[in-house]
């Protein structure tokens, strides 16, 4: 039969009225030994039932020493079978035995739940000897008992290699509702339903949720754990926790924000990095989000420029990093730069525009009418051109890059020469005899090298060779470039 | 053993307000409710809300919204009854009881001795 | 609001004669978790209400049994088998089945 103890009467008590046998105690069960040594064998029993034996886990003795009368069956005698009690008490609870004389060495160990308990658990086992028998108490004390205290107790004895094992103890230990799911953190779309959840659990049982919304009860009548609250939807941001309550009282959750998902806030501190001729490196910082991660953005660029149409270029970009290089841009130009960035709900108005301007560019076309011819006298090659007609962006022409090729047989070499801006003709020494001298000429901006003209070639013929007849760039329209030897 | 012990009796002239308070000993404050009772001469009791004694969230039945409100002092472990712009009909017996929700319902286990305000011009 | 009728309104009973309050809602107290929140409270003289009995038939710690609680849906019944001199006072129904929580009038039991 199975006994139980308990604690002081409960507002409710899951056994409701008296029960046989039964206890719930806060501090110690009714068979719990006085911390005191010596002989005692009054209390060697359970004062809820006298011992017993049963047929179950018993050493049944061979022989006496005299070997004429069988022993009676080896068991522990029956005690308590459950006890429960609060959180934070203290418990102590006892298997007793009564052993013949004749056996030698006898130890008592405690298992919970299926395992041995070693080491720093308050463990006592006491011996009463008699004529024919010692009665052993084994004591087991729990301090300020937590929910992992719960579970059933044993004793175990070996004797003669046979195992003796207790009835289990089964201890309860009650509190406040534990939370095993609480609500989330959510971010939810204007209007849309979304559910929150909340678990608690004892002992004992049952547990009964409240859900709470900014610091108003949602549900008047508790619901039992677990709950789950459908929300219809939300306009504007909320706080929601839940209370769970059983027979030990109430505990509540934690208060968790649900956040409404808007659009984001612009981007700010758009900062100009790089500038070249045709592209413009930015960052930015980002807005807060609207509770949405950022999906990509949008770099907006205007041509400030009273000619221009005010059409605005679009380039769009990931959200991170937060950096864009924006190319195809026309050199020496003035932009208006603005970046919106989006997340699922749509697009954040446009940062700050900031003014950014590109730098020169180099000039988009090579010098005309270049043209080539031998002074041997001077044992030199004299170069002529026209001045290209450059656009504004280009910039300030600050010179000219004049490139000469020199080939003849099994050698070839390239020399580049630098003049200042306001020449329109150059002198380059003869580097090579009887070879071939291809000529090309680039304009030179701040911006950097235009194109190079088509190629003049010009012979060089062994020295005695005379020949003033130039060589020039064709006329526009015209074929390939002659060569006049 | 857990005690609830509220404030003396209150005489007040239409229109103040009165705070009126409920000590709690002997348990763990925090971890129950306080319900509120009104008990007029000759009248049924009637249940005015409850607050969490926690969370301070308070709940009340719709003929006490507006000029009531609960309150708590929790390191003093005491919940308090405040009614605003006090009428005639406000004098009554007020009681507070502790309060939870356990497995036969709500609990109401122990009352406090009650607190009787009078109203009167 | 649920309305909670108790009659009689006074009960006059000789200590040691049985005693019977009744106690109708006006709604089903049947909760939707299969729970009656039927409770009955005892005010005595001068005191403040002590709880007595819930779900319908359950005692409190230290309440006697010779109270005892039936009933089910609307209608609720408290008896007391051999009245004592300490149960005079005044026995309230409550109901904690619906929102707001309410209270019968109150059944005022004395000795003869």
């Known amino acids: 039969a199975i006994t139980e103890a308990r604690e002081e009467a409960k507002p409710y008590p899951l056994f409701p009225g008296p029960l046989p046998g039964s206890l719930q105690t806060d501090h110690t069960s009714l068979l719990s030994l006085p911390h005191t040594s010596g002989y005692q064998p009054a209390l060697m029993f359970s004062p809820t039932q006298p011992g017993r034996p049963y047929t179950g886990n018993v050493a049944i003795p061979r022989v006496t020493s005299a070997g004429s009368k069988l022993l009676p069956p080896l068991a522990f005698k029956h005690t308590v079978g459950h006890i429960i009690l609060s959180e934070h008490k203290d418990v102590k609870f006892n298997c007793s035995i009564s052993v013949p004389n004749i056996y030698q060495d006898t130890t008592i160990s405690w298992w919970k739940d299926g395992k041995e308990l070693l080491g720093a658990h308050h463990a006592i086992t006491q011996f009463y000897p008699d004529d024919e028998v010692t009665a052993i108490i084994a004591s087991f004390s729990i301090t300020s008992v937590q929910r992992s205290d719960n579970g059933s107790y044993i004793c175990k004895m070996k004797i003669n290699n046979e195992e003796i094992v207790s009835d289990p103890i089964y201890i309860e230990v009650q509190g406040l509702p534990h939370f095993t799911k609480q609500p989330e953190s959510m971010n939810v779309t204007r209007n849309t339903a979304f559910n929150l959840t909340c678990q608690a659990v004892g002992p004992p049982e049952p547990v009964n949720i409240f859900w709470v919304q900014n610091s108003s009860r949602v549900n008047e009548q508790p619901e039992k754990s677990p709950s789950v609250l459908t929300v219809p939807g939300l306009t504007e941001m909320a706080v929601f926790s839940c209370e769970a309550h059983n027979d030990k009282g109430l505990t509540v959750s934690k208060g968790v924000q649900i956040n409404i998902k808007a659009i984001p806030s612009p981007p700010t501190e758009v900062s100009i990095h790089n500038s070249t001729a045709h592209s413009i490196l930015i960052s930015w910082v980002p807005g807060f989000d609207g509770y949405s991660p950022f999906r990509n953005c949008s770099v907006q660029v205007k041509e400030v420029d009273p000619l221009s149409n005010g059409s605005v270029m679009i380039f769009n970009t990931s959200a991170s990093p937060h950096m864009y290089q924006i190319k195809q841009l026309q050199a020496l130009a003035n932009y208006s730069i603005g970046v919106s960035c989006m997340n699922e709900i749509g697009w954040s108005a446009v940062s700050p525009w900031i003014l950014a301007s590109t730098t020169e560019g180099a000039p988009s076309v090579a010098p005309l009418n270049v043209t080539v011819f031998l002074n041997e006298s001077r044992d030199n090659v004299d170069i002529r051109w026209m001045k290209p007609l450059t656009k504004r962006q280009a910039g300030e022409l600050v010179g000219y890059r004049i490139s000469h090729v020199w080939q003849s047989a099994g050698i070839s070499k390239e020399l580049l020469e630098e003049v200042g801006q306001n020449n329109s003709r150059a002198q380059i020494s003869v580097q090579v005899h009887n070879a071939t001298c291809t000529v090309r000429i680039a304009a030179v901006t701040k911006g950097g090298v235009g194109p190079f003209s088509d190629p003049v070639k010009i012979f060089i013929p062994a020295h005695g060779w005379v020949d003033h007849a130039p060589s020039s760039t064709p006329a526009p329209g015209n074929a390939d470039p002659v060569l006049i030897i | 053993q857990i005690q609830l012990v509220q404030s003396g009796p209150e005489l007040k002239k239409p229109g103040e307000t009165v705070k009126i308070s409920c000590k709690a000993s002997?348990?763990?404050?925090?971890?129950?409710?306080m319900s509120w009772v009104k008990q007029a001469p000759g009248k049924n009791l009637k249940w005015m809300g409850w607050?969490?004694?926690?969370?301070?969230?308070?709940t009340y039945a719709d003929d006490f919204k507006g000029r009531f409100a609960f309150s708590l002092e929790t390191s003093a472990t005491t919940a308090y009854l405040q009614i605003n712009n006090l009428t005639n009909e406000d004098s009554a017996t007020y009681f507070c009881?502790?309060?939870?929700?356990?497995?036969?319902?709500?609990?109401?286990?122990?009352w406090g001795q009650g607190t009787t305000l009078t109203v009167s011009s | 609001d649920v309305v909670m009728t108790q009659t009689p309104l006074t009960l006059s009973v000789t200590i040691g004669q049985p005693a019977s309050i009744s106690c109708k809602s006006s709604?089903?107290?049947?909760?939707?978790?299969?729970?009656?929140?039927l409770n009955w409270l005892l005010q005595r003289p001068g005191q403040s209400p002590k709880r007595l009995m819930y779900?319908?038939?359950k005692l409190d710690s230290g309440v006697p049994d010779r109270f005892t609680g039936s009933g089910s849906g609307t209608d609720f019944t408290l008896k007391i088998s051999r009245v004592e001199a300490e149960d005079l006072g005044v026995y309230y129904c409550?109901?904690?089945?619906?929102?707001?929580?309410?209270f019968g009038g109150g059944t005022k039991l004395e000795i003869k």
């Open positions: 009881a502790r309060d939870y929700y356990g497995s036969g319902g709500w609990v109401f286990d122990y």
């Open positions: 709604q089903s107290l049947l909760d939707s978790d299969g729970k009656t929140y």
């Open positions: 779900l319908v038939s």
């Open positions: 002997g348990n763990t404050f925090t971890t129950y409710g």
């Open positions: 607050i969490n004694n926690y969370s301070g969230v308070s």
């Open positions: 409550w109901q904690g089945t619906h929102f707001p929580r309410t």
